[in-house]
Amino acid sequence: GQHKPEAPDYSSVLHCGPWSFQFAVNLNQEATSPPVLIAWDNQGLLHELQNDSDCGTWIRKGPGSSVVLEATYSSCYVTEWDSHYIMPVGVEGAGAAEHKVVTERKLLKCPMDLLARDAPDTDWCDSIPARDRLPCAPSPISRGDCEGLGCCYSSEEVNSCYYGNTVTLHCTREGHFSIAVSRNVTSPPLLLDSVRLALRNDSACNPVMATQAFVLFQFPFTSCGTTRQITGDRAVYENELVATRDVKNGSRGSVTRDSIFRLHVSCSYSVSSNSLPINVQVFTLPPPFPETQPGPLTLELQIAKDKNYGSYYGVGDYPVVKLLRDPIYVEVSILHRTDPYLGLLLQQCWATPSTDPLSQPQWPILVKGCPYIGDNYQTQLIPVQKALDLPFPSHHQRFSIFTFSFVNPTVEKQALRGPVHLHCSVSVCQPAETPSCVVTCPDL
C-alpha cells in the first residue's frame, strides 16, 4: 500500500561554538541508514551537505545512525540576521520500510557574540552549599577571570572560584581534558559514583576529585579512549562520559527512575599553531522530546460581558448592542490545551461592517499585536493573570476597544447602522514568555 509521507523521527542538538557550530542528528531506533542533511544556498538551491572545506561544512558519522554537521559561520549556507548566524537545514531519513520521507526543515540559529564564554547562570551557582563546592581555579582570582572559565565566583577567601551546577569542560593548552560534572545536571540527580568514561575504565581514567555534588575528570588527549580526527588544519579530540541507571529490582520486575546520561565532549585545536583550543564543545543528550501527535488546534474569539471577564456573550446574544464609546472586552484563547509552553500572539485585529474579514471598509484595532496608534480611543491590552480557573495565562490574550460605528463613505459623516464584526489573525508559538513569543509594544 501507499505510505503517507511523514517527517523523520529524530532528535537533534545544536551547539554553538566561537567559530563554528555543530549540529548532531540522531534518527530513531528503527532507522536503517543515517539521516541525510540538506541545505539551501543563497539562491534557494538545494544541496546535500558533505565535507566541503570551500563551503565550510564537514559531515561525520556519529554513534548509531547519527550524523554530526559542523559548519563555520562563514559557510556558504550561513547568513547573518538579527545578531544571529542562521542556517536552514533539512533532515531527510528513510524508515524501516525504506519509504522516502519528506524533509523536516529546521532553522539553526547561533548568537553572533559567542567568542566570550558566558558567565554561568546565577541559578547554577547560588544553590551549591559551600561544603559541596569543587574548586575551579586556585584563589586568589578575579571575578572576571573566574567567570571567563565558565565558573562561579564568590567573595569568600577560600574556594572563591568553583564549578557551577552544570557540566564544565576545559581544554588545556597542554592537551588535557578537564571535565567537571554536577550531580544536578540531570533530574533526578546523577549517581556520581557511576559516572565514568565510556571507552576506558582503568584507574588512570577515574575521577581525580569528587565531592557530594561534583566529580572531576582530568586526563590527556592521548589516553582514556579519546579519539582524534584531523581535517585540514583542525584536530578534534573527543570522548564520552556515561552514567549507569539506578535500577530497583523486585520479585516481579525491575524499575528505574533515571534517564540515560551520555555526555560527549570535544576539543578542537589548530594543528599549525601552538595556540589555545579554537573550539570547546559539550554535547549533553537533549531532553526527551514531548509526545506529540497531529490534532486540531482550536482558537476562539469572545466578547466578555464586563471587565472581569467573568461571563461571555453566547451565540444567541449576538449582535450585542452597545452605546458609542462603551468599552468592549475581547478575549482570544487557545482551547483544550494544557501545554504551558504554548503562547498566543495576536498579529492583527480589525473590524469590518460585514462578516467577510477582507471586505471594505476596515478599521485597525491591533497592528502587529499593538494598539493602532491612529485611533484617538486607543485599544487597551489587558494582562491575563493566572488563576485556578485559568492556569495557562499564555493561552489567552485580552484587549478592550471603545464602541464605534463605521461612517458611510458616500454620505459625509453619516454613521452606518449595521453591525461591526471583529477579526484577529493570530499565531501560536512556543516556548511562551520568550522574546520571540511575546509582543512588546512601545510606550505611547
Epitope: K305, D306, N308, Y309, G310, S311, T338, D339, P340, Q385, K386, A387, L388, D389, L390, P391, F392
Partner: antibody, heavy 119, light 106 residues
Framework: QVTLKESGPGILKPSQTLSLTCSFS??????????VGWIRQPSGKGLEWLAH???????FYNPSLKSQLTVSKDTSRNQVFLKITSVDTADTATYYC???????????WGQGTTLTVSS | ENVLTQSPAIMSASPGEKVTMTCSAS?????MHWYQQKSSTSPKLWIY???KLASGVPGRFSASGSGNSYSLTISSMEAEDVATYYC?????????FGGGTKLEIK
C-alpha cells in the same frame, strides 16, 4: 489514588512561627497545571484561603496575611510547606491542604491538622 | 477581593422537598464551584465549573448561574444531604469562599 496529609505542631504560643507540611501522593507537582493550596477553618466558622503554589513555582497569597505567609514545595519529595510567622490566638483553626488540577479547583483535600494558639 | 455572599445562612428542608441556595459575587466570575462539608470532615468538591457534578455526586444535585449570580439546587432533599455548602471562586486571586449555607433536615 490521590491523598494529601497535613502535619503541624498542634499547639503554639503567640508570636511563634507555624510550620506546616502537606505530604501528598497520587499526583506530581511537576505536572503542568497542578497546584496545591492551603485553606484554614476556625472551629464552627467558614473556610479561608491562605496560599497557593503552582507546578512552575508561582505563588499567591491572601493579601490580608501576605506579610506573614511563605509557601514552598519540594517536588521530588511530594511535599508542600506553609510558614506563618508571629501567630496569634485568631490563627487557631484547622489547616487543610488541597490539590488543584487543570479545571479542577481543590478537588482533593487532606484531613486537616488542628492548631491551637494559646499563651 | 471578590466577596461571595451565600443565602440563606441556615435552611431546613423536609425529605423530598426541593432546595435552592444562592451565591452572589461582588465581581463577576467565569465559573462558580461548590463544596460540601459534613461535620468534622474535610470539604469535598461537589460541583465545579458552575454546573458539572464531581465524581460520586448524586444526580439530584444541579447548579447554574453566570456573572455575579449562581445557585445550587437539590431536586429532592435526602437525609444524607445534611451539610454545609460553600461556594468558591477561582477566577482571580485572592481566592474566596462564601460564608456557607447550612442545610438541615426537618
Amino acid at each position: 489514588q490521590v491523598t494529601l496529609k497535613e502535619s503541624g505542631p498542634g499547639i503554639l504560643k503567640p508570636s511563634q512561627t507555624l510550620s506546616l507540611t502537606c505530604s501528598f501522593s497520587g499526583f506530581s507537582l511537576s505536572t503542568s497545571g497542578m497546584g496545591v493550596g492551603w485553606i484554614r477553618q476556625p472551629s464552627g466558622k467558614g473556610l479561608e484561603w491562605l496560599a497557593h503554589i503552582w507546578w512552575d513555582d508561582d505563588k499567591f497569597y491572601n493579601p490580608s496575611l501576605k506579610s506573614q505567609l511563605t509557601v514552598s514545595k519540594d517536588t521530588s519529595r511530594n511535599q508542600v510547606f506553609l510558614k506563618i510567622t508571629s501567630v496569634d490566638t485568631a490563627d487557631t483553626a484547622t489547616y487543610y491542604c488541597a490539590r488543584s488540577g487543570v479545571r479542577r479547583p481543590f478537588d482533593y483535600w487532606g484531613q486537616g491538622t488542628t492548631l491551637t494558639v494559646s499563651s | 477581593e471578590n466577596v461571595l455572599t451565600q443565602s440563606p445562612a441556615i435552611m431546613s428542608a423536609s425529605p423530598g422537598e426541593k432546595v435552592t441556595m444562592t451565591c452572589s459575587a461582588s465581581s463577576s466570575v467565569r465559573y462558580m464551584h461548590w463544596y460540601q462539608q459534613k461535620s468534622s470532615t474535610s470539604p469535598k468538591l461537589w460541583i465545579y465549573d458552575t454546573s458539572k457534578l464531581a465524581s460520586g455526586v448524586p444526580g439530584r444535585f444541579s447548579a447554574s448561574g453566570s456573572g455575579n449570580s449562581y445557585s445550587l439546587t437539590i431536586s429532592s432533599m435526602e437525609a444524607e444531604d445534611v451539610a454545609t455548602y460553600y461556594c468558591f471562586q477561582g477566577s482571580g486571586y485572592p481566592l474566596t469562599f462564601g460564608g456557607g449555607t447550612k442545610l438541615e433536615i426537618k
